[in-house]
């Protein structure tokens, strides 16, 4: 660590005095101190002498000697006071710039340590400090305003009591800058815009920041638009708003609009799309198939997407039959708006009953006219089976009727013993009927098919079973011949 001679922490001299400060180190040494006149510097290897023959109040300050080659970076310091009865203050800088919440050092150095008891900080023209100004004083450094605020950006003077009167320093301007967290915040309204040619439109681009120094512009495709800004300051933020008003839109106005704001921290931008159309439009679509099949007792949501401009003047769900004349309950229909021009309408059909199969239509109206989208809802049923014994053209025949949707397939089984249902161990014979006769097949109704099994002689210790199945389930009917006639067993419920 270098050593300073005289080896005192502070030195008090009068104006005009000769001052010699010598610094000695192991290697070469350097002096650092306030920029002031009349100093002469003489260096000789490991020592350096700073001297003046005519000390003035401007030489007041801390002089530090460092040894650049020292890896520990040690230094020694001495504080010099040049006590001028006419000049109690040496101001090292007339402008101080800090960010909000930093400590601001106003570097007015006291030239006479005796005066410390009577110092104060004031604003220029003797105005008092703003409320909540928290500051401290050090004779060797000046006044420190702690955690400076933007509002404390003022001109200050340091005051000292000399012989009963206050003597002021020259003024120091403090600039407290807002801490800018990033580029300005942006909004662009609306997020999307549609207009018919000839209508009026408005697009609003606004940006805000804690600091006034930022730019904002609205760009159409690649053209910067010349729009006068409206500026405001509220909630401790500066706001700039650009409003594009178009009295009569044309196709040239369509396209991409970008709201761009920039400051020292960077740039933000946000975009929207403006569509200009020739006339009103109303488009209905669904991501679902318009032909729906659902198992009876289950639920279904029918969804329609609507794209429209201008907005809808009316809409509703209608049941078009063919069963009852019931209409969907309004509470089962709901609408959600995805954005200004797109909506989703949903009809909820819980626990579907047979009478609710049929056509459901969504109708919507706007100035462009009426549009409808119709769903066809068919219910799926597991097969219901019945078997009877009859004679056809003199031949004994088992007749199986199966009803369900989708159309059931029919299989006959002959098994030993009397049973409600043939199992694999008992089966004697199996016949598949690939083409049962379709007795009825109306839209939205069950399909009824009939299958015939010609039996020359009914074996009395056997069971004949008709089984029907479709994608929903299966059903069966067991026919047991009895000497006194025939006995049938429907499936257990």
């Amino acid at each position: 660590i270098p050593v300073i001679e005289p080896s005192v922490p502070e030195l008090v001299v009068k104006p005009g005095a000769t001052v010699t400060l010598r610094c000695v180190g192991n290697g070469s040494v350097e002096w650092d101190g306030p920029p002031s006149p009349h100093w002469t510097l003489y260096s000789d290897g490991s020592s350096s002498i700073l001297s003046t023959n005519n000390a003035t109040f401007q030489n007041t300050g801390t002089y530090r000697c460092t040894e650049p080659g020292d890896p520990l970076g040690g230094s020694a310091a001495i504080h010099l006071y040049v006590k001028d009865p006419a000049r109690p203050w040496n101001v090292l800088a007339q402008e101080v710039v800090v960010f909000e919440d930093q400590d601001a050092l106003l570097p007015c150095l006291l030239t006479d340590p005796v005066l410390e008891a009577g110092v104060s900080l004031v604003r220029v023209r003797g105005r008092p400090l703003m409320r909540h100004t928290n500051y401290s004083f050090s004779p060797g450094h000046g006044f420190t305003i702690h955690r400076a605020k933007f509002i404390q950006s003022q001109d200050y003077q340091c005051s000292a009591l000399m012989g009963g009167r206050k003597v002021m320093s020259i003024s120091i301007r403090l600039k407290v800058q807002k801490v800018i967290p990033g580029p300005p915040a942006l909004t662009l309204v609306p997020a999307e815009l549609v207009r018919i040619r000839g209508e009026a439109a408005q697009i609003v681009c606004s940006a805000s920041s804690v600091d006034v120094n930022f730019d904002v512009f609205l760009q159409h495709n690649n053209t910067k638009l010349a729009i006068p800004q409206q500026s405001d300051f509220h909630n401790n933020r500066y706001q700039k708003v650009l409003t594009l008003n178009l009295d009569q839109v044309d196709f040239q106005h369509a396209g991409n609009y970008s709201c761009v704001a920039s400051n020292v921290q960077g740039k933000h931008s946000t975009s929207m799309f403006f569509r200009v159309v020739e006339s009103a439009y109303l488009n209905l679509s669904s991501e679902q198939n318009l032909i729906q099949e659902v198992t009876v007792g289950e639920g279904l949501n029918l969804k329609v997407m609507v794209e429209a401009y201008p907005g809808l003047q009316g809409f509703n769900w209608t049941y078009l039959g063919p069963f009852s004349d019931h209409q969907p309950e309004p509470k089962l229909a709901n609408a959600t708006t995805k954005d200004t021009y797109r909506h989703t309408f949903t009809l909820s059909l819980p626990r579907l009953k047979p009478s609710e199969a049929g056509r459901y239509s969504f109708l919507a109206r706007n100035p462009g006219g009426w549009r409808a989208l119709t769903f066809e809802l068919t219910l799926r049923y597991p097969p219901e089976v019945s078997v009877i014994w009859t004679f056809i053209n003199g031949s004994g025949t088992l007749l199986c009727a199966a009803s369900g949707y989708p159309q059931p397939n029919v299989t006959w089984l002959q098994c030993s013993g009397h049973t409600d249902r043939c199992d694999e161990a008992q089966v004697l014979q199996v016949w598949d009927d690939p083409y049962p006769e379709v007795l009825s097949q109306e839209p939205f109704h069950k399909v009824t098919v009939q299958s015939l099994l010609t039996v020359e002689t009914l074996e009395h210790n056997q069971t004949y079973e008709c089984r029907a199945h479709n994608s929903v389930g299966s059903g069966s009917w067991a026919f047991i011949p009895i000497s006194a006639g025939a006995h049938t067993h429907p499936p257990d419920e």
């Epitope: 006034v212 910067k224 010349a226 729009i227 006068p228 409206q230 008003n245 009295d247």
Partner: antibody, heavy 123, light 107 residues
């Protein structure tokens, strides 16, 4: 030479409408926004609004919304201002003024002015 | 709206002398201020924009200064043709507003 030539004086009855014109020459008409300024009887100046001749965008001083309508005819490099429902309060000299420093920046001072159109409203 | 106040409606001046015209904004306008000169029966003429920038062709005896809310137009070596009315205008925020004007008169 950059010039803005305004239409002649107008004498109108209360309740009537008037449309005054401002023909631009010596520069690209669509490149600079056109502003309109009112000066009542030697008094101060009031900004009415502006129009972007290329794009058609308008900005009005709220005080003149509904009173003034700004339009342009690009083919003849002419800007128009229509004043409706005239009253004696509308008697004034109306100037068209070109916005200076066209660069998409936000500077809205007026570097070229028309000579003014005097509108007198009297029964 | 931002109000622009020109505190002196009239100022008595001496030819060859110096005059300072003041303009105060009701809010901070970030130096977005223009000065205009208007001769009787004529349209206003732009002298200064950006509070300090002299327009091309405007004599150097005109100068502008100020910041924040307070601005001044100074004319040195006053000529006869300068004894007219001067307006300030802010273009920081719409609606753009003008001061009420300061008319110079020879003492």
């Amino acid at each position: 030479e950059v010039q803005l030539q305004q239409s002649g004086p107008e004498l109108e009855k209360p309740g009537a409408s008037v449309k005054i014109s401002c023909k631009a020459s010596g520069y690209s008409f669509t490149g600079y926004n056109m502003n309109w300024v009112k000066q009542s009887n030697g008094k101060s100046l009031e900004w009415i609004g502006n129009i972007d001749p290329y794009y058609g965008g308008t900005t009005y001083n709220q005080k003149f919304k509904g009173k003034a309508t700004l339009t342009v005819d690009k083919s003849s490099s002419t800007a128009y201002m229509q004043l409706k429902s005239l009253t004696s309060e509308d008697s004034a000299v109306y100037y068209c003024a070109r916005r200076g420093d066209y660069s998409g920046s936000s500077y809205w001072y007026f570097d070229v002015w028309g000579a003014g159109t005097t509108v007198t409203v009297s029964s | 709206d931002i109000q622009m106040t020109q505190s002196s409606s009239y100022l008595s001046v001496s030819l060859g002398g110096r005059v300072t015209i003041t303009c105060k904004a009701s809010d901070h306008i970030n130096n977005w201020l223009a000065w205009y000169q208007q001769k009787p029966g004529n349209a206003p003429r732009l002298l200064i924009s950006g509070a300090t920038s002299l327009e091309t062709g405007v004599p150097s005896r005109f100068s502008g200064s100020g910041s924040g809310k307070d601005y001044t137009l100074s004319i040195t070596s006053l000529q006869t043709e300068d004894v007219v009315t001067y307006y300030c205008q802010q273009y920081w925020s719409t609606p753009f507003t003008f001061g009420s004007g300061t008319k110079l008169e020879i003492k």
